[in-house]
Amino acid sequence: IWELKKDVYVVELDWYPDAPGEMVVLTCDTPEEDGITWTLDQSSEVLGSGKTLTIQVKEFGDAGQYTCHKGGEVLSHSLLLLHKKEDGIWSTDILKDQKEPKNKTFLRCEAKNYSGRFTCWWLTTISTDLTFSVKSSRGSSDPQGVTCGAATLSAERVRGDNKEYEYSVECQEDSACPAAEESLPIEVMVDAVHKLKYENYTSSFFIRDIIKPDPPKNLQLKPLKNSRQVEVSWEYPDTWSTPHSYFSLTFCVQVQGKSKREKKDRVFTDKTSATVICRKNASISVRAQDRYYSSSWSEWASVPCS
Amino acid sequence: RNLPVATPDPGMFPCLHHSQNLLRAVSNMLQKARQTLEFYPCTSEEIDHEDITKDKTSTVEACLPLELTKNESCLNSRETSFITNGSCLASRKTSFMMALCLSSIYEDLKMYQVEFKTMNAKLLMDPKRQIFLDQNMLAVIDELMQALNFNSETVPQKSSLEEPDFYKTKIKLCILLHAFRIRAVTIDRVMSYLNAS
């Protein structure tokens, strides 16, 4: 058993049929010595008396809020949560496996630049009685500070018969140099509590590996004189690290005909313009990637030819 | 430690082209190592990230763009010097700071060159003949060092009398390649910045 936060405790249980469970001793936080009784949750049934209560925790029915009273007055609470271990593996029932970039990916994180700010998100089908708390650091043995905000519900989607909820959190490394060469990874730890079930999820990464620039901005077409061609131009996204001559991007330019079956024409370029033959109903799209370290491509910025 | 003395050539300093070739060569070599050594811990998640140039050179700090010198987090690790002006032109007006930056890059390359050559000598003795260093990568390191054009004492290749542990050597190769790729990215960024200055 260990303390998650004040008056909230996590009991770690090997979860299999007829498992013996864990013996837990609860102590009432009071100077009083006698006349103390214990109850669980809303029940008025007295579970025991005295300053301590010993219980055998085997299943969710044994978890919950234990309260010690004296003469009708509440003295203190202890909330017991269960953390299940099945076949030596901690349960992952609360969050959905996103399977990207690999199986057992519950947390996904992205950064728009090298400033040390990043966003992580996760998915669940659970809609109520759910809380998350997020901690992060650079390295684990001698951790350096990363500050995370509160996790918030950022999107709801319908997937077949199920509703899916996306939660996200923003974190910022306390002292980040965009030009630094990372040697210690960022660690992100998410504590998830659903009703009386506790689970924890972790992710470890270098900022350089989770970079995904915003799409290029100001994608524009300028017709060229006496020609079917247009000059396509775009700019670095505002959120990208500066100076741009140091933090350079490369771009993918794509021309897509009106029919999705039509083969796309595409090139890579380091420049922020290109000349394109713009056919009716075609569209031009541009996306960006760090020029020197191949992490993710941005989403496409698109403009119609008409 | 004496910094090498710059002996600039007249005309364009072809650093950018060579640094792009360097990044491409080390990325290809790393990819090859990951594939060939698939049953060894060779991915970014599995290896310890070591920097053989730590406390010997200060490339990130010496080559910090002017715009980042206002960021205190970029200044707290060492006595820092910045690129204050100049481009990747080997003119006689090359600033002292830029010379410091380029000499630091040169020292990095020299250190990695020695390590890679020593390692290759060991790998050539491996009866499995599983992996060797790409000669193209070694040649590209050499070309960039020549383009940087610094005079520096030659570092003798390390020789070892004991029987090499090939497993350890291959893991060390992965560690070195990951670190060198990260440094090659920094070098490429620096050259691009200098070229645009």
Epitope: D265, A274, T275 | -
Partner: nanobody, 125 residues
Framework: QVQLVESGGGSVQVGGSLRLSCVGS????????MGWFRQAPGKEREFVAA????????DYRDSVKGRFTISRDNARNTMYLQMNSLKPEDTAVYHC??????????????????WGQGTQVTVSS
């Protein structure tokens, strides 16, 4: 294996025009980016113009924009460079090149794996 052969070079007065052609054989080139590069005596080879596989996207070095036009005819496996308002500084050997679109930025020399022998362009005043 792709073979590339350039033609159309020659000598011309300042302000004159030339049309260079590059014919590919050995493989259909419609999946390849193609480009023109030039090398003047004693200078590095430099990018002139490039065009995408289907011919819809192109780019030029700043000094030739508005004077040169790159195009291609995939049915004939041929790429062209129409050069107008020629200047003495355009004097060079012009090489055509072909490379997979995914090999890298199409304005960069190293993104091209196949190269022609070159055709000489001389602009005299």
């Amino acid at each position: 294996q792709v073979q590339l052969v350039e033609s159309g070079g020659g000598s011309v007065q300042v302000g004159g025009s030339l049309r260079l052609s590059c014919v590919g054989s050995g493989r259909t080139l419609n999946m390849y980016n193609m480009g023109w590069f030039r090398q003047a005596p004693g200078k590095e080879r430099e990018f002139v113009a490039a065009i995408s596989g289907k011919g819809l996207i192109s780019d030029y070095r700043d000094s030739v924009k508005g004077r040169f036009t790159i195009s291609r005819d995939n049915a004939r496996n041929t790429m062209y460079l129409q050069m107008n308002s020629l200047k003495p500084e355009d004097t060079a050997v012009y090489h055509c090149a072909a490379g997979q679109w995914s090999a890298g930025p199409f304005t960069r020399e190293r993104s091209y794996e196949y190269w022609g022998q070159g055709t000489q362009v001389t602009v005299s005043s």
